[in-house]
Interface confidence: low
């Protein structure tokens, strides 16, 4: 029968089993979320999308998975990070105290995931999905992305640290996940402070980046939400992740 | 600093179980998942899972699912492995150990060991 | 569950040398390019104690003649040189999947 085309890819292949396995993986290696039963996470995200046109999903449509999986972090230790999640997941399977969204229950479940249904069927589409720019943003994935975003940021305390690309032409990107919903999500009565590690590129990039235009326009933003601001330079990544394996060496001592 | 005292010897029947404990200080005991390791004559270390006593989640090594039952006493600071229906081959010394950090899945804190002993 | 081989079983040194002690893994113990093998040592009557984390990163409080190398499934363990006091069991053990593993010691003896 006719399907409606769209332009982004369609539902990762084996999708229910991913999202099952990930959660049955996740679930046995984090013993606070023992509890959690998988059968049900699976039932809330698809009843999320599942025969809802998928440009017309909403925040309220996740939020019974929302509540499956409320998990919280210990202050002083939320990762935020904008086009550079490599690195930050490098940093955080090494500083293993500290969490991005991904090392969350929810974000674990859908990391490089693509999903969609159909309207009034019961059928995921594995054909093609809607794309943020050419069809709509208020599609599956998205709003997925946007509502566990924003709560990851509310419950967010203490010294909040977001990594961002030093290589890109706008280091601070208001349209990001980070600059359009997560800024605006931290609670100043719970956050002390947002510190931004600027990570370069190049070898020889010496330039302080916290100059950067975009970033000042960040530390205004926070600001503003009565939030303090700091910002480091991370000159040399690859030292950056040895250094945070091992502290004491001796070449840590000088700059990162 | 932080340390771990365990209880001591125990040498107990077949079929029977033993209960060991694991005290611990210097740290706050709610916000470390507390392992338990075997070490049995001749035979290398075990994992047999952890506990985590902030809400008593655990998570077993499959080998040691049903057998083992880790407790914790989060007002005594301590926590308690039991292992039930014994055998010879669970005459070992166990060990409770805590990881650097959360996640931090290497053992920096040990404790001195419990010597179980199963004999008739 | 990932198997860990270590060899050689013993090792027969005196103070001064070289050892190595080789850990091999039945798959990669690689994720987010760090090798996620620690190394610990064991002395009769006591706990081990561990001396590196993370393939190469050296404990607090853990002399400079310890260090570890390796990625993927081959790690070593190199003491150089050898102290008195370094003669022990020495085991590997992986925390990449449930059930983390130990390998099967390498006892170093005075030659």
């Known amino acids: 029968r006719w399907r409606q085309q769209w332009s982004g890819s369609g539902t990762t292949s084996r999708f229910p089993e991913t999202v099952l396995a990930r959660c049955v993986k996740y679930t046995e290696v984090h013993p606070e979320m023992r509890h959690v039963d998988c059968q049900s996470v699976w039932d809330a995200f698809k009843g999320a999308f599942i025969s809802k046109y998928p440009c017309n999903i909403t925040e309220e449509d996740y939020q019974p998975l929302v509540k499956l999986g409320t998990q919280t972090v210990p202050c002083n230790k939320t990762l935020l990070w904008s086009r550079i999640k490599d690195l930050a997941h490098q940093f955080t399977q090494v500083q293993r105290d500290m969490f991005t969204l991904e090392d969350m229950l929810l974000g674990y479940l859908a990391d490089d995931l693509t999903w969609c249904g159909e309207f009034n069927t019961f059928e995921i589409n594995y054909q093609s999905c809607p794309d943020w720019r050419k069809d709509c943003s208020n599609n599956p994935v998205s709003v997925f992305w946007k509502t566990v975003s924003r709560r990851f940021a509310e419950t967010a305390c203490g010294v909040v640290h977001v990594m961002l690309n030093g290589s890109r032409s706008k280091i601070f990107d208001k349209n990001s996940t980070f600059g359009s919903v997560e800024v605006h999500n931290l609670q100043p009565e719970k956050v002390q402070a947002l510190e931004a590690w600027v990570i370069h590129g190049g070898r020889e990039d010496s330039r302080d980046l916290c100059q950067d235009p975009t970033i000042k326009e960040l530390e205004s933003i926070i600001s503003k939400r009565n939030i303090r601001f700091f910002c480091k330079n991370i000159y040399r990544p690859d030292k950056f992740l040895q250094c945070v394996k091992n502290p004491e060496d001796s070449s840590c001592l000088s700059g990162i | 600093q932080v340390q771990l005292v365990q209880s001591g010897a125990e040498v107990v029947k077949p079929g029977a179980s033993v209960k060991m404990s694991c005290k611990a200080s210097g740290y706050t005991f709610t916000s470390f998942n507390m392992h338990w390791v075997k070490e049995a004559p001749g035979q290398r270390l075990e994992w047999i899972g952890y506990?985590?006593?902030?809400?008593?989640?655990?998570n077993y090594n499959q080998k040691f699912q049903g057998r083992a039952t880790l407790t914790a006493d989060t007002s005594a600071s301590t926590a308690y492995m039991e292992i039930s229906s014994l055998r010879s081959e669970d005459t070992a010394v166990y060990f409770c150990a805590r990881t650097g950090g959360l996640r931090r899945a290497y053992f920096t804190y040990w404790g001195q060991g419990t010597l179980v002993t199963v004999s008739s | 569950d990932i198997v860990l081989t270590q060899s050689p079983a013993t090792l027969s040194l005196s103070p001064g040398e070289r050892a190595t002690i080789s850990c091999r893994a039945s798959?990669?113990?690689?994720?987010?390019?760090?090798?996620?093998m620690h190394w610990y040592q064991q002395k009769p009557g006591q706990p081990p104690r561990l001396l590196i984390y993370?393939?190469?990163s050296r404990a607090t409080g853990i002399p400079a003649r310890f260090s570890g190398s390796g990625s993927g499934t081959d790690f070593t363990l190199t003491i150089s040189p050898l102290e008195p006091e370094d003669f022990a069991v020495y085991y590997c053990?992986?925390?990449?999947?449930?059930?983390?593993?130990f390998g099967g010691g390498t006892k170093l003896e005075i030659k």
């Open positions: 053990q992986q925390n990449k999947e449930d059930p983390w593993t």
């Open positions: 798959e990669s113990v690689d994720s987010y390019g760090n090798g996620f």
């Open positions: 506990i985590y006593p902030g809400n008593g989640g655990t």
């Open positions: 993370l393939a190469s």
